[in-house]
Amino acid sequence: GGGGAAPTETQPPVTNLSVSVENLCTVIWTWNPPEGASSNCSLWYFSHFGDKQDKKIAPETRRSIEVPLNERICLQVGSQCSTNESEKPSILVEKCISPPEGDPESAVTELQCIWHNLSYMKCSWLPGRNTSPDTNYTLYYWHRSLEKIHQCENIFREGQYFGCSFDLTKVKDSSFEQHSVQIMVKDNAGKIKPSFNIVPLTSRVKPDPPHIKNLSFHNDDLYVQWENPQNFISRCLFYEVEVNNSQTETHNVFYVQEAKCENPEFERNVENTSCFMVPGVLPDTLNTVRIRVKTNKLCYEDDKLWSNWSQEMSIGKKRNST
């Protein structure tokens, strides 16, 4: 429990409930305490969103949420004299905020972003169905380390998709990655309905490809050593090592979750380097290796985006065809 005595009579409703938007997707509700609340009541506020989601009991007279404003969102607020969830709060007051106006069919679709190598973000979208072909799009973005909303300058086109990329560098030793990037796409003429998205910085991360440093044979094992992409520590990555043998025309793919350089055959203490031993490889044939990496769930929410493949490296000799 919390606060003072909890009178059985219901408290009056909160007053002056209002809602506003900060940045691109930060919705903030504020209210005033109820008029004529019991003097022996230590006020707490019960609030939840329209679909009874995210119930909260707190003493603050504000509540905020980071949400893409593509749909109407409502908050209901009531007052009560304790933190007890079973206590009946006052009459709930509701305040809603609607997305910007416009024909829903004019809004862009499939708005999504990928954070490339923790250094730049690339967003893409499809034009809305009810729009002119000469629509000029603008993407705006905001995150905690920016003082104001920025406009993305590098608009490009890939087939039917439009896109824009902007610098976004991981800040070391901060809670940077616990936050999100807020995105909005609209047109310069104001004819289309704006579209919003929120990109958590722990998801949709695509590393650069790794760089193979060394291939060597020891008995019938192939030792592969590579450098991981900058900005990533090896424990945060999973790997796929592909080995193609020209003679047997075999194509082996190894899914590697841990790639430590512990064998004496590997070069030691090289920073940001990973290693893997491929068993049973014929040294007197040509073997071509390539590697790709992806983030894992130890460090990131998302583990679906593979890097592009590394450049290939070969070892062994190609047999002459007889």
Epitope: T109, L126, R129, N130, P133, G159, Q160, Y161
Partner: antibody, heavy 118, light 107 residues
Framework: EVQVLESGGGLVQPGGSLRLSCAAS????????MTWVRQAPGKGLEWVST????????YYADSVKGRFTISRDNSKNTVYLQMNSLRAEDTAVYYC???????????WGRGTLVTVSS | EIVLTQSPDFQSVTPKEKVTITCRAS??????LHWYQQKPDQSPKLLIK???QSFSGVPSRFSGSGSGTDFTLTINSLEAEDAAAYYC?????????FGQGTKLEIK
């Protein structure tokens, strides 16, 4: 050269199923929506279904909704149309078309004939 | 749903004549109207995109005009190889809708 080629048509009984394929080449497949359009014998063109380049947006004509399923495999540069609960009125030449720009069809296949008859 | 009405349904013309086919939309569709040609036993081919833009490789005798609800396909100096069905298509919203077609016969 940009090309699309349909396959999988044939004779099927009412209530039966058929799966059409459309193999594409000569362009970055995942950047373009693909569409199925059909033409009943001696009749005009009718839009059937569309799938966006990355496969997140899928649309159907009311006449096939709930019976047909469009899908794509971007690693194989192929789009599919799974047709279930086929009816006589589904008899048509089925064309696969690549979409371009703001939703027009710039490349069409030669079509594959689907005949629904007992 | 957008309804497209083409006229005429059928036209018989002599070579070198000028031909005009019209397409009327049931509501304004901006310039989201495209014209296709389909010769007998062939698949359709794009002629005009966005109401008035010629598609690459299309002979210059084909041109398009209009916006909103009224659109026109014009063939200047008709040639024998232009015998075909012509369709207008709206891409304004979904579903895509096709006109019923205009069949052009060369006398």
């Amino acid at each position: 050269e940009v090309q699309v080629l349909e396959s999988g048509g044939g004779l099927v009984q009412p209530g039966g199923s058929l799966r059409l394929s459309c193999a594409a080449s000569g362009f970055t497949f995942s950047n373009y929506a693909m569409t199925w359009v059909r033409q009943a014998p001696g009749k005009g063109l009718e839009w059937v279904s569309t799938i966006s380049g990355r496969g997140y947006s899928i649309y159907y004509a009311d006449s096939v909704k709930g019976r047909f399923t469009i899908s794509r495999d971007n690693s194989k540069n192929t789009v599919y149309l799974q047709m279930n609960s086929l009816r006589a009125e589904d008899t048509a030449v089925y064309y696969c078309a690549k979409e371009e720009g703001h939703w027009y069809f710039d490349v069409w296949g030669r079509g594959t004939l689907v005949t629904v008859s007992s | 749903e957008i309804v497209l009405t083409q006229s005429p349904d059928f036209q018989s013309v002599t070579p070198k004549e000028k031909v005009t086919i019209t397409c009327r939309a049931s509501q304004s569709i901006g310039s989201s109207l495209h014209w296709y040609q389909q010769k007998p036993d062939q698949s359709p081919k794009l002629l005009i995109k966005y109401a008035s833009q010629s598609f690459s490789g299309v002979p210059s005798r084909f041109s398009g005009s209009g916006s909103g609800t009224d659109f026109t396909l014009t063939i200047n100096s008709l040639e024998a190889e232009d015998a075909a069905a012509y369709y207008c298509v709206s891409s304004w919203g979904l579903p895509y809708t096709f006109g019923q077609g205009t069949k052009l016969e060369i006398k």
